[in-house]
Structure formats: C-alpha cells, structure tokens
Amino acid sequence: MADNFSLHDALSGSGNPNPQGWPGAWGNQPAGAGGYPGASYPGAYPGQAPPGAYPGQAPPGAYPGAPGAYPGAPAPGVYPGPPSGPGAYPSSGQPSATGAYPATGPYGAPAGPLIVPYNLPLPGGVVPRMLITILGTVKPNANRIALDFQRGNDVAFHFNPRFNENNRRVIVCNTKLDNNWGREERQSVFPFESGKPFKIQVLVEPDHFKVAVNDAHLLQYNHRVKKLNEISKLGISGDIDLTSASYTMI
C-alpha cells in the first residue's frame, strides 16, 4: 500500500467544525462562538450526526458510548446529548443518570484508578482529529489540576485549572519553550468542583486544541508548538483521582 502521507497532510484538517464524538450542544453559548465558524449543527445530538461524520454509528473506539466502553453508556451514538433546560449540563455539575453514564459511581468507569501524576504515552505523536478523554474526580479541597502536552522538555500546551489563585478560580493555559513560559491565556469560566467527577476532552485541530469539560465547550488554545507530531506524552497531575485517560481518532 502506497503511503505518501506527510505531516502537511495531517494538518490540512477535515473541515468539519463539529465532528462526531465532540460535544455537539453548547448550552447558552451562541452559535459560532468559541472558534466554531458557521454555528453548530441543529439537533446533532442525540440522534443525528453532523454531515460527514458517522451517522447512526459510533466512530471506532469512541469514548464513551462505543459498545463495550462503559457499562450503561448508550450505543450507538457517541454522546447522548445534554439534558434539556437552560444550560448544557445539570446544575449540580454532574451528569444525570439518564445521560452518558450510569448513576453507579463516577462515570461508570470500568477499572481501578490510575496513579497521579500520570504520563499518557502518545507514541505516534499528536495528530489532528485525535480526541483525548480524561475521566476522574476532583479531590476535596483541591488546589490545582494540570495537563501538560510534552515535546521533549518543552510543554506545547499546559492546561491548568487553579482552584484558589488569590481567592479566585481560574484556568491558565500556556506553553513552555526552552525552559521559558510564554504569555498566559486565562479563562474565568470554571467548570470543575471539588469532590465532583469530571470529564475533560481535548480535541486536536490543525491550528488549535479544543477543550471541553463535562460535555460543554470550554476553550481553545492556538498551537504555539507547530510540530504537533513531536509531542510524545501527556502529563496529568494535580489534586484528582484519575479514572482513565485514553484517546481515539475521530
């Protein structure tokens, strides 16, 4: 089989602003906000996939909802859609029992917790259309969470929820190159709660990372390290109990 694929090909992207496996409803977020040109797909979740995705079928290995992935998760269809109401997520900050996960424990995870800090290998590097899903529970009285996409000694993307920075809750994103941190990007929307379960999804796009928490879009971070394919691990640290960390291509 001929394989003329290059990194340039990978970075050309699919052009689908709302791929299957990525949260499709954004609560009160206006259409097109958060770097989604042209609005989201009406009625995309549940029951309808956006054009060009996987109608009526979970993409292979999608998480959760793929057959066998989590007991009680609906399949086919990747995410069953948020509860009705003014927001995209229940006010408690936890998924309802009728959502993607069963009510029996945090996200119905299949196996014991992972040791934090945790390094998730990315043995082929980071590529566009890679969807990374991290499930866990914030510890009581948590101070911080950190995700670090590492390229050698550099940190291509540092995602750092801080629970008490000068009595404020804030998410700080940054990049570290040659041992120097760059300009911080700060986000005051803070979807994490001490003691509560969470789901973080990071979708790699050709020119940015998209981050969603608990099925709601949170932020995007433009690539400062362009050689995505040289990022070889994702460090997960902080005040969390980590249930799982995995990825799929969508």
């Epitope: 694929f5 066998g68 995870a109």
Partner: antibody, heavy 119, light 107 residues
Framework: QVQLQQPGAELVKPGASVKLSCKAS????????MHWVKQRPGQGLEWIGM????????DYNEKFKNKATLNVDKSSSTAYIQLSSLTSEDSAVYYC????????????WGQGTTLTVSS | DIVMTQSQKFMSTSVGERVSITCKAS??????VAWYQQKAGQSLELLIY???NRHTGVPDRFTGSGSGTDFTLTITNVQSEDMTNYFC?????????FGAGTKLELK
Amino acid sequence: QVQLQQPGAELVKPGASVKLSCKASGYTFTSYWMHWVKQRPGQGLEWIGMIHPNSGSTDYNEKFKNKATLNVDKSSSTAYIQLSSLTSEDSAVYYCTRWGIYYYARDYWGQGTTLTVSS
Amino acid sequence: DIVMTQSQKFMSTSVGERVSITCKASQNVGTNVAWYQQKAGQSLELLIYGASNRHTGVPDRFTGSGSGTDFTLTITNVQSEDMTNYFCEQYSNFPLTFGAGTKLELK
C-alpha cells in the same frame, strides 16, 4: 510502498557494541515516530524506545536506558539502535517499527535483525 | 510496569470455528490496546488498534473488543492461515508493554 529494511543477522562478541540499522522508504521519514522492539524466544516482546526523526527527540524504556541509544540519519532515511556492553542476554531479534498516524499503532514493522552475542 | 496477561499460550481450534483470544491488563489502559499477528519466521503485522479498530486490509473475521482491563481478539470463521501467534500491546503507560503471546493451533 512503505518498507523498513533491516539486515538479517549480526554476530558480535561479548563486551562489544553494535549498531543496527533500519532504512525507511515509501513515506515521509521525518513525520513518524520510529520505535524499536526486542524479541527473545520464550521472553516475548519488549519495547526499547522511540525516536522522532525530525527532532531526534527520544523516549526510552528505563530498562534499556543504559543499554540502547537511538539515533537517525535524515539524509538517508535510516534509523539506528546502538547496543553496548553486549552479553548473551542481548541475543535477540530487534525490530524497527513505525508508529502510524492514521492507524495509531505499529502499522509497519521491519523484518528484524537477529543479533547473536557469542565468543 | 503494566503487565499484559495472555493467559492461554496455546489455543486449539478448527477451520471454520470461532475463537476468542484474551488479554488482561494489570491496570486500566482505556482503549489503548493493539493486536498483532506474527507468522512463523516473520515479523509482526497490525490487526487491531484502539482496542476495536481494524487495520486497513485486515479481513473482517478479525474483531477486537474491550476496554479498561479486559480485551478480546475474536476470529470468526477461522482459516488455516490464522493458525499462528497473536500478541496484544498496551500503549496507555510507559513503558509500552506486550502480552506473552497466544499461539493458535489446529485441533
């Protein structure tokens, strides 16, 4: 057509070092991580480490950090593994494997080099 | 290190039958598991990645399933050329680790 070409066999003496090669063709060498895997009869498969040909960035299995050194020659699209202070425990088949991008796993393997360490 | 246990070193089957090869991880590896086939005297070939995704060109009689700690490679309508070695690998944690292999034999 993707190919990873490895010499069939190497015979070296205990205490010596050896450098095994893996010549890649049929794809953009600098766009994919190259991994090395050791297979001993009855011992299964062991991951040694990985290298990105563009940057030379490496990750090693701790077990092999003092045994193996990975490098590449971009001009010839060749990956190398150097094994030092050889003993009979290092006698094995060594595979270079490409980690895929579309197919996120070891999508291509070399034929392997059989290394025999013997006096 | 994560240990990938393929509890059956050998499995006997017949042409046309269905067989399931199992692999158990010592801790949660999500869906970060691949399956490879190794024919005698040859290198390995990718069958399944991401626990359940069939590699291009792999016959659809090969199916992967599982997540967390328990994984299965199922071969339906086994063919004579399938009588060979199968290895699982986890890539959820460094170091990446393989199962010891399962050899499919003719009953």
